[in-house]
Interface confidence: low
């Protein structure tokens, strides 16, 4: 790719990314700040993906420029136009796919010079997962269910009072392939629970960590989970 | 009434360990994070980082190696010290209370200690 | 981390006036982690939303939260002389917790 660009003689300029996951069948934002510049007829944005012949997507002089723009990403990205103005090149990438996990190039020109910065974006799929009580179960159980994980997360219980104790002998985990043949759905029983205790059913894959927790007492149940991406760092 | 008081040193020279405390008044110390967010004059908010009552910490990665929090339950106080300070660190720093239980938002927050670093 | 940045920077509107504060996020968040403050000088904020939508105790119905995924939206239906303010908006659905870098409602 050859960019006919006047740029000899420019300086180059500070462009970060950030380093990110995508939740497969939703949209995702691959983040890319620069440098500001005065004029938006002066900006360029690329994006450019490693071992992807066509651009993603390129910016120029105000509008998208998609005519080198690769098929597999045809329809599916756009930048957020009235932001490019105030520095912000990031890239909305719609119904992420497995396949767009890999190394992305953010490459920017502006009238102060040019500069590039590189992401990883993994993809996956996580959700948040739910703790209830079983009122359907023999004894005190609970039932902590997400619906959308990819890769097979690994599935922990942990409980305040008995900090630290393993409770893999008292749970019982299985993993149901969803319709679309690629994320599935988690569900973990934990049996023999006790009245006044908070449990954490905590989820984990490569790409994220999820926590759902439950505290029962006699008068009332409370709920809560947390969702944490792993690895996200800046460049 | 939940109420949150901080006190510790305004004035510091680079290099030194920034410390300040928060008392809480009023409510459970348990099923919250407590935290603790700084504001450099006429900028925005930087959350700094939490504990919980289990002492469990979580802290921003950008000031990860400088941060420490710690909480004394039977006081209902927490703590935070961030070393090696530069004039970079000069803020308002707030102490807050995060219900992780209901809404996930800062109810409550201290009355805010301007810290300034100078030489 | 994700990154939520606030649009406009400042808003100059008059009492009485509709205000849309914006906030985009740079990754999907879960409503269940937005919420918006309200400052003042040499105050701390306070919690105007909580959930993305929710208002907390003792906020006027004319303070409204409203989005999802990564576009979130205060609204201030008829602006009172003490709104005028700098408003952030704040995530936790992916740690570490991040600020918006705010928006000043400012008298036109």
């Known amino acids: 790719l050859i960019i006919g660009f006047g740029i000899s003689g420019r300086h180059s300029i500070t462009v970060t990314t950030v380093a990110s996951a995508g939740n497969i069948g939703e949209d995702g934002i691959l983040s890319c700040t620069f440098e500001p510049d005065i004029k938006l007829s002066d900006i360029v944005i690329q994006w450019l993906k490693e071992g992807v012949l066509g651009l993603v997507h390129e910016f120029k002089e105000g509008k998208d420029e998609l005519s080198e723009q690769d098929e597999m990403f045809r329809g599916r990205t756009a930048v957020f136009a009235d932001q490019v103005i105030v520095g912000n090149a990031s890239l909305r990438l719609k119904n992420v796919q497995l396949t767009d996990a890999g190394t992305y190039k953010c490459y920017i020109i502006t009238s102060k010079g040019k500069g590039n910065a590189n992401l990883e974006y993994k993809t996956g799929a996580f959700s948040m997962p739910e703790v209830n009580v079983d009122y359907n179960a023999s004894s005190e159980t609970l039932r902590c269910e997400a619906p959308r994980w990819f890769p097979q997360p690994t599935v922990v219980w942990a409980s305040q009072v008995d900090q630290g104790a393993n409770f893999s002998e008292v749970s019982n985990t299985s993993f149901e392939l969803n319709s679309e043949n690629v994320t599935m759905k988690v569900v973990s029983v934990l049996y023999n629970v006790t009245i006044n205790n908070t449990y954490s059913c905590m989820i984990e894959n490569d790409i994220a960590k999820a926590t759902g927790d439950i505290k029962v007492t006699e008068s009332e149940i409370k709920r809560r989970s947390h969702l944490q991406l792993l690895n996200s760092k800046a460049s | 009434q939940v109420q949150l008081q901080q006190w510790g040193a305004g004035l510091l020279k680079p290099s030194e360990t920034l410390s300040l405390t928060c008392a809480v008044y009023?409510?459970?110390?348990?099923?919250?994070?407590w935290t603790w967010i700084r504001q450099p004059p006429g900028k925005g908010l930087e959350w700094i980082g939490e504990?919980?009552?289990?002492?469990?910490?979580n802290y921003n990665p950008s000031l990860k190696s400088r941060v420490t929090i710690s909480a004394d339950t039977s006081k209902n106080q927490f703590s935070l010290r961030l070393s090696s300070v530069t004039a970079a660190d000069t803020a308002v720093y707030y102490c807050a209370r995060l219900s992780s239980w209901s809404n996930w938002a800062f109810e409550y927050w201290g009355q805010g200690t301007l810290v300034t670093v100078s030489s | 981390e994700i990154v939520l940045t606030q649009f406009p920077g400042t808003l100059s509107l008059s009492p009485g006036e509709r205000a849309t504060l914006s906030c985009r996020a740079s990754q999907s968040v879960s409503s269940t982690y937005l919420a918006w403050y309200q400052q003042k000088p040499g105050q701390a904020p306070r919690v105007l939303i909580y959930g993305a939508s929710r208002r907390a105790t003792g906020i006027p119905d004319r303070f409204s939260g409203s989005g999802s995924g990564t576009d979130f939206t205060l609204t201030i239906s008829r602006l009172e002389p003490e709104d005028f303010a700098v408003y952030y908006c704040q995530q936790y659905g992916s740690s570490p917790l991040t600020f918006g870098g705010g928006t000043k409602v400012e008298i036109k």
């Open positions: 009023g409510g459970s110390f348990s099923d919250y994070f």
């Open positions: 504990i919980n009552h289990s002492g469990t910490t």
